[in-house]
């Protein structure tokens, strides 16, 4: 499956919606911030075969359009960068699902590497905790913010390096 | 490989205006801040202030509040350091360098080779 | 502001000594202080991060422990490359600052 030019494009447009999100001053917030162990071996696209990439992109994806779909998110963002940046991320989610369906009949590994997608999950998961235990602080979510602009990046080198596969 | 590369040494007079520079390259320039760093002749580090290049937002040490102006402009992925009117106590060397923001990551990981500033009459 | 008090400012240590420096900030900042190398005309080089995490590249002779308001660099084993100033750095609070800077020369 070749992910369409247009699914870079949407990462690169979630990003920037990501980075015009801020609503206080991130300079207040540096004690706040806070080691969630991105599991950056997951987003190494030479140890995958090329489903299992894809796969780690969709639960990367997927938890990430999660996590800003909730109420708490949306009485933190301004309410229209916030649905156009999960639009952004539906698309994309869009895009890799068609991807993981060709893929399947492609490879005869297993689709789903079910430690990587743990571990995306088990990130998400501390990402969550955070925000709990922080009360969903307006630093709490601006590091929370800050963390999914790193691991989107990693998500579009690795759907670079998928492209160079090709 | 990720650099910062700073303009080169300056002679000036007391009274007159300078702007250095601090070039960023091998990185996502706007997902760093840059922070700028004193050091006079015999001394020690002293952190001057920080700019966000994503947005432009800026913070200066009290010490350096009104005395000097922190800019960045994305497009050319470099930042700036200047003052509108040179003191013979500005006479140090200067060093951008990058830092991660909120990311859990190391701070001030990479610096600029410093530029000499040379105020004298 | 944060201040932060490096001793000793100066040491005169040998090759293979096991050296310590210590870092007190005038109030915590949990673990977010940093560790800086400096040779003469050269800019600064970051060695440890979050008070004990070793950057890339930095030799495991160095390393950083403490949290709160009391830090250590150690140096296992002096090297000749070794002979520098070193900084602490807290990344707490803004505004940042930095030890007055402790000089590590050859006995």
């Known amino acids: 499956c070749d992910l369409p030019q247009t699914h870079s494009l949407g990462n690169r447009r979630a990003l920037i919606l990501l980075g015009q999100m801020g609503r206080i001053s991130p300079f207040s917030c540096l004690k706040d911030r806070h080691d969630f162990r991105i599991p950056q071996e997951e987003f190494d696209g030479n140890q995958f075969q090329k489903a299992q990439a894809i796969s780690v992109l969709h639960e990367m994806i997927q938890q990430t359009f999660n996590l800003f779909s909730t109420e708490d998110s949306s009485a933190a963002w301004e309410q229209s960068l916030l649905e156009k940046f999960s639009t952004e991320l539906y698309q994309q989610l869009n895009d890799l699902e068609a991807c993981v369906i060709q893929e399947v009949g492609v490879e005869e590994t297993p689709l789903m590497n079910e430690d990587s997608i743990l571990a995306v999950r088990k990130y998400f998961q501390r990402i969550t905790l955070y925000l709990i235990e922080r009360k969903y602080s307006p630093c709490a979510w601006e590091v929370v913010r800050a963390e999914i602009m790193r691991s989107l990046s990693f998500s579009t080198n690795l759907q670079k390096r998928l492209r160079r596969k090709d | 490989e990720v650099q910062l590369v700073q303009s080169g040494a300056e002679v000036k007079k007391p009274g007159e205006s300078l702007k250095i520079s601090c070039k960023g390259s091998g990185y996502s320039f706007t997902s760093y801040w840059i922070g700028w760093v004193r050091q006079m002749p015999g001394k020690g580090l002293e952190w001057m202030g920080i700019i966000d290049p994503s947005d432009s937002d800026t913070r200066y040490s009290p010490s350096f509040q009104g005395q000097v102006t922190i800019s960045a402009d994305k497009s050319i992925s470099t930042a700036y350091l200047q003052w509108s009117s040179l003191k013979a106590s500005d006479t140090a060397m200067y060093y951008c360098?990058?830092?991660?923001?909120?990311?859990?990551?190391?701070?001030?990981?990479?610096w600029g080779q410093g530029t000499l500033v040379t105020v004298s009459s | 502001d944060i201040q932060m008090t490096q001793s000793p400012s100066s040491l005169s240590a040998s090759v293979g000594d096991r050296v310590t420096i210590t870092c007190r900030a005038s109030?915590?900042?949990?673990?977010?202080l940093n560790w800086y190398q400096q040779k003469p005309g050269k800019a600064p080089k970051l060695l440890i991060y979050f008070a004990s995490s070793l950057q890339s590249g930095v030799p495991s002779r160095f390393s950083g422990s403490g949290s709160g308001t009391d830090f250590t660099l150690t140096i296992s084993s002096l090297q000749p490359e070794d002979f520098a100033t070193y900084y602490c750095q807290q990344s707490h609070t803004l505004p940042l600052t930095f030890g007055q800077g402790t000089k590590v020369e050859i006995k």
């Open positions: 360098a990058r830092h991660p923001g909120l990311a859990w990551a190391p701070d001030f990981d990479y």
């Open positions: 109030q915590s900042i949990d673990d977010f």
